[in-house]
């Protein structure tokens, strides 16, 4: 299981005339249920229930994004409608180029997620936890526009972060 | 301070191809999208093709037989190529920047004509 | 293709408010977010974004200009209108591809 280097832009307009941008880094690993690719896109949050739908075609979205999805407890969602596999199947289908799960609440996912699957999907499948899933979803429930970029070698330059 | 500047012929025979190239500075190709848009004189605004900060390339499905979009992310230009001009590509052609979501325009070139006539 | 419908113009009175209208034949929400936008451009010169997905202001942009809606309706507010807005608007979604503009509505002041 490699380590996936996430990095997460945030964009501000400023009365100015430019955006500002905050660039945070942080860190998950790939699971076996997807390639081991980097990967970049605008962050669309979906909620696991929000992925249970099926309208597949309607809500195909094409241009490359990353899901970023906040598993609950399992308690709180005893009979789920897909798995987290299934979930990330899901999202791929609707045009994410890659899937980050917050597993924090859920860290049976993780082994899930890690099974061999004899088809995994063929764009990245992440996941995060403790520490960097807290920074993730702060900027993710700002609400702004942010993108994230996955890769799977450390970002080349050092750069330069700030706490959210 | 982000800048494009579009260059390319301003006449071009019909039937020929088209070559268009867009410079920018102020921003990297690599964290940004850029998209071609023109515009025929007095009428509204068309979107034709657009390269990704990772390379992904998408086409006005309605002109994409004629169309070809690259980059040279060393000089900052991207390139747009259109065959078999008609006399209705007749258009102002603008490059466009999206920092934040691939098709939203929050840079623009100064356009260039490019009259089809023989 | 998704379609955009704007009215073609618009006159208002110098300091009045104006409201610009686009309408789309589909939903132009996804999981949350609603990806329409909208720009201005002055005679002779390049389009310029005022708003992004429904109700941001672009960077640089005075607070007179707004935007609202989700799903298929969609509106700019101007308000209160300055000599300088006279200009064609133009809505654009980029909820599916192609990303499609409205015909435009020209701003006119009375």
């Known amino acids: 299981k490699e380590t996936a280097f996430v990095e997460v832009v945030l964009f501000e307009s400023s009365p100015s005339g430019d955006y500002t941008t905050y660039t945070t880094g942080l860190t998950g690993r790939f699971s076996r249920a997807g390639a081991t690719l980097s990967a970049e896109g605008e962050i669309v949050q979906m909620h696991p229930l929000g992925l249970c739908n099926n309208n597949d075609e309607e809500d195909l979205y094409e241009y490359g994004w990353v899901g970023v999805v906040k598993l609950e407890q399992p308690e709180l969602d005893p009979k789920p409608c897909l798995t987290v596999l299934g979930k990330a199947k899901r999202a791929v289908q609707r045009g994410a180029t890659a899937v980050i799960f917050d597993v924090s609440e859920n860290p049976e996912a993780i082994d899930q997620l890690n099974q061999g699957s004899e088809d995994p999907l063929k764009r990245p499948v992440v996941y995060v936890k403790g520490a960097d899933a807290i920074k993730l979803m702060n900027i993710v429930n700002k609400q702004k526009v942010a993108r994230a970029r996955i890769q799977h070698r450390p970002p080349r330059q050092p750069t330069e972060y700030f706490d959210m | 301070q982000v800048q494009l500047k579009e260059s390319g012929p301003g006449l071009v025979q019909p039937t020929q191809t088209l070559s268009l190239t867009c410079t920018v500075s102020g921003f990297s190709l690599t964290s940004s999208t850029v998209s071609w848009v023109r515009q025929p004189p007095g009428k509204g605004l068309e979107w034709i093709a657009a390269i990704s900060s990772a390379e992904n390339t998408y086409y006005n499905s309605g002109l994409k037989s004629r169309l070809s979009i690259s980059r040279d992310t060393s000089k900052s230009q991207v390139f747009l190529k259109m065959n078999s001009l008609q006399t209705e590509d007749t258009a102002m052609y603008f490059c466009?920047?999206?920092?934040?979501?691939?098709?939203?325009?929050?840079?623009w070139g100064q356009g260039v004509m490019v009259t089809v006539s023989s | 293709d998704i379609v955009l419908t704007q009215s073609p113009a618009l006159a208002v009175s110098l300091g009045q408010r104006a409201t610009i209208s686009c309408k789309t034949n589909?939903?132009?929400?996804?999981?949350?977010?609603?990806?329409m936008h909208w720009y201005q451009q002055k005679r002779g010169q390049q389009p310029k974004l005022l708003i992004y997905l429904a109700s941001n202001l672009a960077s640089g942009i005075p607070a007179r200009f707004s935007g609202r809606g989700s799903g298929t309706d969609f509106t700019l507010t101007i308000d209160p209108v300055a000599t300088d807005d006279t200009a064609t608007y133009y809505c654009?979604?980029?909820?599916?591809?192609?990303?499609?503009f409205g015909a435009g509505t020209k701003l006119e002041l009375k």
């Open positions: 654009q979604q980029t909820r599916s591809l192609p990303p499609t």
């Open positions: 466009a920047g999206g920092r934040i979501l691939e098709t939203l325009f929050d840079s």
């Open positions: 589909q939903n132009v929400d996804f999981y949350g977010k609603t990806y």
